[in-house]
Interface confidence: low
């Protein structure tokens, strides 16, 4: 027989199948040109000394063979003696060490058996009613196909599924979607209505994330507020990476989970923009304001659950950076200015009313005045900070007020509003005898003492009504008692107390008269 023809004789070996687990398998035959055909197969087991024979039986019952030696691929033409227009049955017999191993048979019409391609190019993945939908363009001249898929997770082996018949320029498949694990999919195709024809190769992996992106397990820390009024937000713990199936490890697109940082500045609500979204790698600097920080995880199906943290305001206060002057026309604040053309946000809130909205004002961009100060003024009629109570004032600055991450804290301090001089006057001044020449003076704490850093000191004044001599005694702001000594018995004294701030002398309390009784000895 000629090597290019199928030989209609008995093959040169004994026809006994060894029943071995090794041997030829996965035979596929198809047309590769108008008159050319190809069959190929796999051989499992040791290949030394193995000879392969492609067997073919026609519908008439006549059978022939091609001897291919050690090759597992054979090309032949429609002139090789094999009927290409009628159904034929093909299989491989591999002969080695005096025994024969047979492949499973395939029955097909060779002329109609076109080598089908797997889905190529871009496979679009979307979610449809809790299932996964894959869609791709049908390879050229291959409309009409059966499609199968196989899928696996990081912990499972391949499972086979059926996409059903396809008969259009685009093909699609509905597949199961896992809630919490990533999956790898592959697809293959074969000609529709030709059960004996061979399947295409499997497509490249399609990597699909779980329906729910994983909850981002991250932790933040915030550095101390620097001298520039900013503090760095740092990531203490990176998000855990998703476990991936074998074919999706490496730079496989599709399963990526992206994490974004959403920053919401709670202080200064009158500024232009309160929220900003950044990539998680780009950790920002923050002002000393309070923030909510959310980490949003998202994959190709959209955003998943997010985690939110509250970053409290930096409570460190500057004792004297803010100067407030109250005049007849109104009130002006002065503070050390930042660079040229800086916008300031001034926010204040009565102490103890932290749950309520702070009053917030945005200045026009302003340059430092000749003394290097920035200012903000308001009229008396506005009633702002007019009540006699303690206010917490924070001033923020930015040269780019619409950029949330470029705000910084200028100062944070306390101020007693209204007529602090009168409101701060100590009440309930009482005098008790202490010894033969001394008394103890007590008073109730000034309202100013509720305002951290505002009360500089108490001053106790004692006047001798006989001689009109006056002595003044400074007292620490934390004390509400002082002992007056070297007093004379029988002399009338008056005592008064006042509370002073750094920039304001308080009003004296009502005079309290007392005297030390003369001790009469028996």
């Amino acid at each position: 027989c000629r090597t290019s023809e199928c030989c209609f004789q008995d093959p040169p070996y004994s026809d006994a199948d060894s029943g071995s687990a090794s041997g030829p398998r996965d035979l596929s035959c198809y047309r590769i040109s108008s008159a050319g055909y190809e069959c190929s197969w796999q051989y499992e087991g040791p290949t030394a000394g193995v000879s392969h024979f492609l067997r073919c039986c026609l519908s008439s019952g006549r059978c022939c063979y091609f001897a291919t030696g050690s090759a597992t691929r054979l090309q032949f033409s429609d002139q090789a003696g094999v009927s290409v227009l009628h159904t034929v049955t093909l299989w491989v017999e591999s002969w080695a060490r005096n025994r024969t191993e047979k492949s499973p048979e395939v029955t097909l019409q060779l002329y109609k058996s076109v080598k089908y391609k797997p889905p190529l190019g871009d496979i679009k993945v979307s979610k449809l009613a809790g299932q996964l939908r894959m869609e791709w363009e049908t390879p050229d001249n291959q409309v009409g196909a059966e499609v199968q898929f196989r899928h696996r997770t990081p912990s499972s082996s391949w499972k086979l599924g059926d996409c059903g018949p396809q008969d259009d320029d685009t093909e699609s498949c509905l597949c199961p979607l896992e809630m919490n694990v990533a999956q790898e999919f592959q697809l293959r195709r074969r000609r529709l209505g030709s059960q004996g024809s061979s399947w295409s190769k499997w497509s490249s992996p399609v990597c699909v994330p779980p329906e729910n992106p994983p909850q981002p397990q991250v932790r933040f820390s915030v550095e101390q507020l620097g001298r520039d009024g900013r503090r760095r937000l740092t990531l203490k713990e990176q998000p855990t990476q998703l476990e991936l199936p074998e074919g999706c490890q490496g730079p496989a697109p599709g399963v990526e989970v992206t994490y974004q940082l959403q920053l919401h500045m709670l202080s200064c609500p009158c500024k232009a923009k309160a929220t900003r979204t950044l990539p998680l790698e780009k950790m920002p600097y923050l002002s000393g304001a309070a923030y909510n920080v959310a980490v949003i995880s998202s994959n190709r199906f959209g955003p998943g659950p997010n985690q939110t943290w509250h970053i409290p305001a930096d409570t460190h206060t500057e004792p004297v950076a803010l100067n407030i002057s109250v005049g007849t026309n109104g009130t002006t604040m002065y503070w050390p200015a930042r660079a040229q053309s800086t916008t300031y946000c001034i926010e204040w809130q009565p102490v103890g009313q932290e749950g309520s909205l702070a009053t917030c004002n945005l200045t026009a961009p302003q340059d430092p005045d000749p003394a290097g100060m920035a200012t903000y003024s308001w009229s008396r009629e506005s009633g702002a900070m007019g009540q006699e109570k303690c206010y917490h004032i924070t001033i923020f600055a930015s040269a780019h007020p619409k950029k949330l991450t470029l705000w910084s804290t200028v100062l944070s301090t306390y101020h007693f509003g209204g007529n602090a001089s009168a409101a701060g006057t100590p009440h309930h001044v009482s005098v008790k005898n202490h010894s033969l020449d001394s008394v103890s003076v007590d008073w109730a704490p000034s309202l100013l003492s509720t305002c951290p850093g505002v009360l500089k000191e108490y001053v106790v004044r004692c006047r001798d009504e006989d001689s009109n001599q006056v002595s003044e005694h400074p007292v620490q702001p934390t004390e509400t008692q002082v002992t007056l000594s070297d007093l004379r018995a029988g002399v009338a004294y008056t005592v008064q107390v006042r509370a002073d701030t750094a920039w304001l002398r308080g009003a004296w309390s009502q005079p309290q008269r007392f005297s030390i009784k003369v001790q009469v000895s028996d």
């Epitope: 609500p269 004002n361 009229s379």
Partner: nanobody
Framework: QVQLQESGGALVQPGGSLRLSCVVS????????IGWFRQAPGKEREGVSC????????IYSDSVKGRFTISRDNAKNTVYLQMNSLKPEDTGVYYC????????????????????WGKGTPVTVSS
């Protein structure tokens, strides 16, 4: 509903003056910011000047500081823009806009995100 009606736009020579008026109706809040914006042909809309409702605090863009003055007459629900020493670059459609006081007692906010807008009045400065 809230309505703003501008008037006073005209053709004027460089160095001349104009006074724009904006009448507000249908707005009842005590606290609001109101202002003037302009849009030159082929350019973005920009803030010119704004005024706060309660304390009368004002804000001006650098390009008009010292030449334009914003004022208001609460009784007439009207805001004015007095424009002096006009220049060709002041040409454009001038819009009046209003927004409520953004959680602020005595503040103002002069942004293109104002909630209510008038239809505009054209100002042309040309010789």
């Amino acid at each position: 509903q809230v309505q703003l009606q501008e008037s006073g736009g005209a053709l004027v020579q460089p160095g001349g003056s104009l006074r724009l008026s904006c009448v507000v109706s249908g707005f009842t809040s005590d606290y609001f910011a109101i202002g003037w914006f302009r849009q030159a042909p082929g350019k973005e809309r920009e803030g010119v000047s704004c005024i706060g409702s309660s304390d009368g605090s004002t804000i001006y863009s650098d390009s008009v500081k010292g030449r334009f003055t914003i004022s208001r007459d609460n009784a007439k629900n009207t805001v004015y823009l007095q424009m002096n020493s006009l220049k060709p670059e002041d040409t454009g459609v001038y819009y009046c806009a209003l927004d409520r006081g953004r959680r602020t007692i005595i503040g103002y906010a002069c942004y293109a995100t104002m909630k209510y807008w008038g239809k505009g009045t054209p100002v042309t400065v040309s010789s």
